[in-house]
């Protein structure tokens, strides 16, 4: 079944290469297990950046080596991507799946354009 997911259109990464935004999805009702996937679209290619599952009882948890972190509250997920470089500029799409209990719902946001500007190297001091 289809479901709406919303995310901001544009986000500017910090000078440290960190970008955060909220992904909000249509009310979960009794959704007990939710899977959140961050996808990056470059041209016609879509690649998975990171994914995490959380339950109504347990907090959102990405893998330890993931480039993403996040927190969940109701039908909102606050996502943070780290280690971004200028070449990481692109459209980041939030995909939400309400896995359990049935029925299964899936929703995809329109994407957040993340702009990453690499910091200028510090000039050598004499």
């Amino acid at each position: 079944k289809g479901m709406h997911a919303a995310q901001p259109a544009v986000v500017l990464a910090s000078s440290r290469g960190v970008a955060s935004f909220v992904c909000e999805y249509g009310s979960s009702g009794n959704a007990a297990e939710v899977r959140v996937t961050m996808l990056r679209q470059a041209g016609s290619q879509m690649t998975e950046v990171c994914a995490a599952t959380y339950t109504v009882e347990d907090e959102l948890a990405f893998l330890d080596d993931s480039t993403c972190t996040g927190t969940s509250s109701g039908n909102k997920v606050n996502l943070t991507i780290q280690g971004l470089r200028a070449m990481g500029t692109g459209l980041y799409i939030c995909k939400v799946e309400l896995m359990y209990p049935p029925p299964y719902y899936v929703g995809m946001g329109n994407g957040t354009q993340i702009y990453v500007i690499d910091p200028e190297p510090c000039p050598d001091s004499d």
Epitope: S27, S28, G29, N30, A32, E33, R35, T53, T55, V56, E57, E97, M99, Y100, P101, P102, Y104
Partner: antibody, heavy 116, light 112 residues
């Protein structure tokens, strides 16, 4: 603390209707489904179905389609089990149980006796 | 419907012994998410069932670590490492992966 408190024992005649309540407290009622489980005297547990406490949509096990109805009074954080046209084989203890990804909290049970 | 078959029906044990209860499902109970919604409950006489284990092997809060769950696919086991008097009662497995969700027939743990 989380509690599910069910209504008291019922004695009914065949053909009558019973409505059992399950009042929840200590958590957000609409975040968890409410399940109903039947246990006939000396028998095991039988899952009857569940109701989505956010949408009100019920799901029934095949054996309980027809005479059984789940309902809600969301403002009172209460779920109901109604059984119509009672039969002797409806004599049992009925439990409500909250479910996220597990049946973690249960009501104390309501004993229904159907006898002419 | 998924049939959950528990063995044995009755398990006489001495206090301090290890007890093992088996639960077999008639088909795989791995859910589409990859999770397996297999749970174990204990019901003591005159009481409501109590959750012990969920998702095959996760112990519910407050459940002693002498209880452990294992298994995958269609075969699951509940082990009690050192049986205490308070562990006596009827144990039920339950699958919440495929509707209608179903209980096993129960295993009665009793003193030998």
């Amino acid at each position: 603390q989380i509690q599910l408190v069910q209504s008291g024992p019922e004695l009914k005649k065949p053909g009558e209707t019973v409505k059992i309540s399950c009042k929840a407290s200590g958590y957000t009622f609409t975040n968890y489904g409410m399940n109903w489980v039947k246990q006939a005297p000396g028998k095991g547990l039988k899952w009857m179905g569940w109701i989505n406490t956010y949408t009100g949509e019920p799901t029934y096990a095949d054996d309980f389609k027809g005479r059984v109805a789940f309902s809600l009074e969301t403002s009172a954080s209460t779920a109901f089990l109604q059984i119509n046209n009672l039969k002797n084989e409806d004599t049992a203890t009925y439990f409500c149980a909250r479910r996220g990804v597990r049946l973690d909290y249960w009501g104390q049970g309501t004993t229904l006796t159907v006898s002419s | 419907d998924v049939l959950m078959t528990q063995t044995p029906l009755s398990l006489p044990v001495s206090l301090g012994d290890q007890a093992s209860i088996s639960c077999r499902s008639s088909q795989s109970i791995v859910y589409i998410s990859g999770s397996t919604y297999l749970e174990w409950y204990l019901q003591k006489p005159g009481q409501s069932p109590k959750l012990l284990i969920y998702k095959v092997s996760s112990r519910f809060s407050g459940v002693p670590d002498r209880f452990s769950g294992s298994g995958s696919g269609t075969d699951f086991t509940l082990k009690i490492s050192r049986v205490e008097a308070e562990d006596l009662g009827v144990y039920y497995c339950f699958q919440g992966s495929h509707v209608p969700w179903t209980f096993g027939g129960g295993t009665k743990l009793e003193i030998k």
